[in-house]
Interface confidence: medium
């Protein structure tokens, strides 16, 4: 049965969704305002954002007394969304106040702003490294879901109708479907990864869904208003059940499993793709792009960053 990893503002927790006694285990406590959470399964690493401390932090699972490490501690204001590229070994995040989407190495180095224009309230972010795409929600004045290459290329709005407060976002990697929750319109919908063939999953009976994740045939989501975690069948919306209630303040949620992070080889593995700094996955040939930290230019060879990086 799936392990659910979730941020609970003052801590990050784990719960076995299929357990007989549904009790959550604290992964890390004493936090200010943990909002977004993700993991790197192969290393047992957990990453989260803290919107009060304006930071991205990290710890390790299954390591007694594992220290909390700072990953990014400057230039953030409200890092609402976070996603770990487990293949390219990068962190992607959204910030709803600086209105940016950024990427960096897992240790926070070689940080690059990918998008800084036409963003209002970017929130959830999800990755499909196998195809080199990233997806995010924006619940600003023009609510929408967008898609772009993980290298910042080919940005496109894929959902902009019947949408108001798109909060949760997750990808069904096997079936190549995008799921999202709308807190204002009280629904969970799904569509193809280009936004086509949209379908209802749950409608009308949600209070304030915030984050969304998936395992097998089951969707899991957190609800701000009821302060609980719920589940249902990903296709029909049936088999609704409450997984955990009376939580402090459940925020982002992930299914902690190898299945959610299937491994495959990329050109970035071999000598960092020949890149001096960032090797970012891309949806188009050669399926990777060399990039430089913000403020540093790429040389004409397309691989090396100019001095000062």
């Amino acid at each position: 049965s799936p392990l659910l990893l979730f941020a609970n503002r003052r801590d990050v927790r784990l719960v076995d969704a299929g357990g007989v006694k549904l009790e959550s285990t604290i992964v890390v406590s004493g936090l200010e305002d943990a909002a977004a959470v993700d993991f790197q399964f192969s290393k047992g690493a957990v990453y989260w954002t803290d919107v009060s401390e304006e930071a991205i932090k990290q710890t390790y699972l299954n390591q007694t007394g594992a220290a909390v490490q700072n990953v990014v501690i400057s230039g953030l204001v409200s890092p609402d969304g976070l996603a770990c590229d487990w293949v390219g070994k990068k962190l992607y995040w959204t910030d709803s106040e600086t209105n940016r989407i950024e990427v960096a190495n897992l240790n926070g180095t070689s940080r690059k702003v990918l998008f800084w224009q036409d963003l209002d309230q970017p929130r959830a972010i999800a990755l499909d490294p196998a195809h080199g795409y990233m997806y995010w929600t924006d619940w600003g004045e023009t609510p929408r879901i967008e898609r772009a290459g993980m290298d910042g290329s080919t940005r496109k709005i894929i959902v902009d109708s019947d949408i108001y407060w798109p909060n949760g976002l997750t990808i069904d990697l096997e079936e190549q479907k995008l799921y999202w929750a709308d807190a204002k319109l009280s629904f969970i919908h799904r569509a193809n990864l280009d936004g086509s063939f949209r379908q209802k999953v749950v409608e009308g009976s949600l209070t304030h869904p915030f984050a969304l994740t998936l395992s097998g045939d089951t969707l899991y989501w957190t609800d701000w208003q009821t302060r609980s975690i719920h589940a249902c069948n990903k296709r029909t919306g049936g088999k609704r059940k409450e997984i955990l209630s009376a939580l402090y303040s459940p925020m982002d949620i992930q299914v902690l499993s190898q299945e959610r992070q299937p491994f495959f080889h990329t050109r970035c593995e071999e000598d960092n793709g020949g890149c001096s700094h960032l090797c970012l996955l891309s949806p188009s040939e050669p399926f990777y792009t060399c990039a430089c930290p913000t403020g540093v230019q790429l040389q004409d060879n397309g691989r090396t960053c100019k001095a000062g990086a």
């Epitope: 503002r9 200010e32 305002d33 919107v51 009060s52 304006e54 204001v77 409200s78 709803s96 106040e97 309230q121 619940w139 600003g140 407060w165 208003q225 303040s249």
Partner: nanobody
């Protein structure tokens, strides 16, 4: 539970100033974002301003931006609303609110369910 008590309201002429205070008790004040709302007669309660727990970030409704300033003193468990250049349309009952989180967008700040604790309000009348 957190108890909130507002003070500082009263009658003021257009163009004048007032400073509202909200004293909190019964909880760890620094754990809460604080906000001010107002409700004019016959109208819905509307968001005015909010401040993060640390005091590092503040947020304002467009109608008060540049005129009102929210601040907090965590050592005194008090949040303030300094109101300058007051206008007749600022006349309302002003409420203090507390929440364990604050959003940057007024879409969330205006959601009254989002704010967990409320004061009883203090009346501000702007009239000549």
């Amino acid at each position: 539970a957190v108890q909130l008590v507002e003070s500082g309201g009263g009658l003021v002429q257009p163009g004048g100033s007032l400073r509202l205070s909200c004293a909190a008790s019964g909880g760890t004040f620094s754990s809460y974002a604080m906000g001010w709302f107002r409700q004019a007669p016959g109208k819905e309660r509307e968001f005015v301003a909010a401040i993060r727990r640390s005091g590092r970030r503040t947020y304002y409704a467009d109608s008060v931006k540049g005129r009102f300033t929210i601040s907090r003193d965590n050592s005194k468990n008090t949040v303030y609303l300094q109101m300058n250049s007051l206008r007749p349309e600022d006349t309302a009952v002003y409420y203090c609110a507390a929440a364990r989180r604050v959003r940057s967008s007024t879409r969330y700040n205006t959601g009254t369910w989002w704010w967990e604790y409320w004061g009883q309000g203090t009346l501000v009348t702007v009239s000549s």
